[in-house]
């Protein structure tokens, strides 16, 4: 960053897709700012125009491609720089020599379904989104449940160490409501950091056979 | 490789209004900043108007402040201009232009172009 009031964050998601946050304390609102995108060895520059998020922040993504299209590599490096308009001039706010598979956040794991549900039981499955194939199996997932009467961050979290895209939830209270979220994270990259929460997949047990313990 | 399609141009009186579109296949459009420029008889390719991917900010030649706008609908992959108040100096063959680099769009050297749609202006 260009001064100390100044964090300028970016996550690539492992395809076509680098999302930056800026930050900076003053900042003019109406300023026109843009995020430009300079790699080191790619014929192309990308720009994307930052978007306020919050007071002093802005936020904007770097399309690079089709969705699915491997756009860079580990070797690559990508200078990022904010630049804001001043006058007639626009000048660099912040700049970070972007190395893409050490700050890597995928999209949030998608297709969450139930596979077979019981009374204690339920098996769910998903599927990662827009994950680069050099990865091969080296992901985790990390999973919570929402029961009754608690909040997200009261449900313990469930640590799946491999590419393993499904889980069999047990333990469950029969004929209840309940919601399902997974995330997921390469384990290459020093800044890498989860993903956001998929979208929360309910589902309900099923009742308790009449007459009989459970 | 991107493609870029015009339509809109013609035939009107100064003082008039024409709008028109710039449809973008091939690629993802929200990539791109658009521009339109324009080529009269004779003179070389000017800049007139450009959006960022957003949307959000307009940039224009002198010549056509407060007559000109230029949009975008990112669902329609689709850049407009609209042109009010046309004037005989607006009569040139009038060019849609993308770039991934917001700060290259200005420049002939680097972009997409479409084939031009012709506007003349007749007094």
């Known amino acids: 960053a260009v001064n100390g009031t100044s964090q300028f964050t970016c996550f690539y998601n492992s395809r076509a897709n680098i999302s930056c946050v800026w930050s900076q304390d003053g900042a003019l609102q109406d300023t026109s700012c843009q995020v430009h995108a300079w790699p080191d060895r790619r014929r192309w520059n990308q720009t994307c125009e930052l978007l306020p998020v919050s007071q002093a922040s802005w936020a904007c993504n770097l399309i690079l491609g089709a969705p699915d299209s491997q756009k860079l590599t580990t070797v690559d490096i990508v200078t990022l720089r904010v630049l804001c308009r001043e006058g007639v001039r626009w000048r660099v706010m912040a700049i970070q020599d972007f190395k893409p598979f050490e700050n890597l956040r995928l999209m949030a794991p998608i297709s969450l379904q139930v596979v077979h549900v019981e009374t204690h039981r339920c098996n769910i499955s998903w599927e990662i989104s827009q994950a680069s194939h050099y990865f091969e199996r080296h992901l985790e997932f990390e999973a919570r449940t929402l029961s009754p009467g608690h909040t997200w961050e009261e449900a313990p979290l469930l640590t799946l160490k491999q590419k393993q895209e499904w889980i069999c939830l047990e333990t469950l209270t029969p004929d209840t409501q309940y919601e399902f979220q997974v995330r997921v994270k390469p384990l290459q990259g020093e800044f890498t950091t989860w993903s956001p929460w998929s979208q929360p997949l309910a589902f309900r047990t099923k009742p308790a056979a009449l007459g009989k313990d459970t | 490789e991107v493609q870029l399609v015009e339509s809109g141009g013609g035939l009107v009186q100064a003082g008039g209004s024409l709008r028109l579109s710039c449809v973008v296949s091939?690629?993802?459009?929200?990539?791109?900043?658009m521009a339109w420029f324009r080529q009269a008889p004779g003179k070389e390719r000017e800049f007139v108007a450009a959006?960022?991917?957003?949307?959000?900010?307009?940039e224009y030649v002198d010549s056509v402040k407060g007559r000109f706008t230029v949009s975008r609908d990112n669902a329609k992959n689709t850049v407009y201009l609209q042109m009010n108040n046309l004037e005989p100096e607006d009569t040139a063959v009038y060019y849609c232009?993308?770039?991934?680099?917001?700060?290259?769009?200005?420049?002939?050297?680097?972009?997409?172009w479409g084939q031009g749609t012709q506007v003349t202006v007749s007094s």
């Open positions: 091939g690629d993802v459009f929200v990539r791109y900043t």
């Open positions: 959006v960022t991917d957003s949307g959000r900010t307009t």
């Open positions: 232009a993308a770039n991934t680099d917001y700060f290259q769009i200005r420049s002939v050297d680097n972009n997409a």
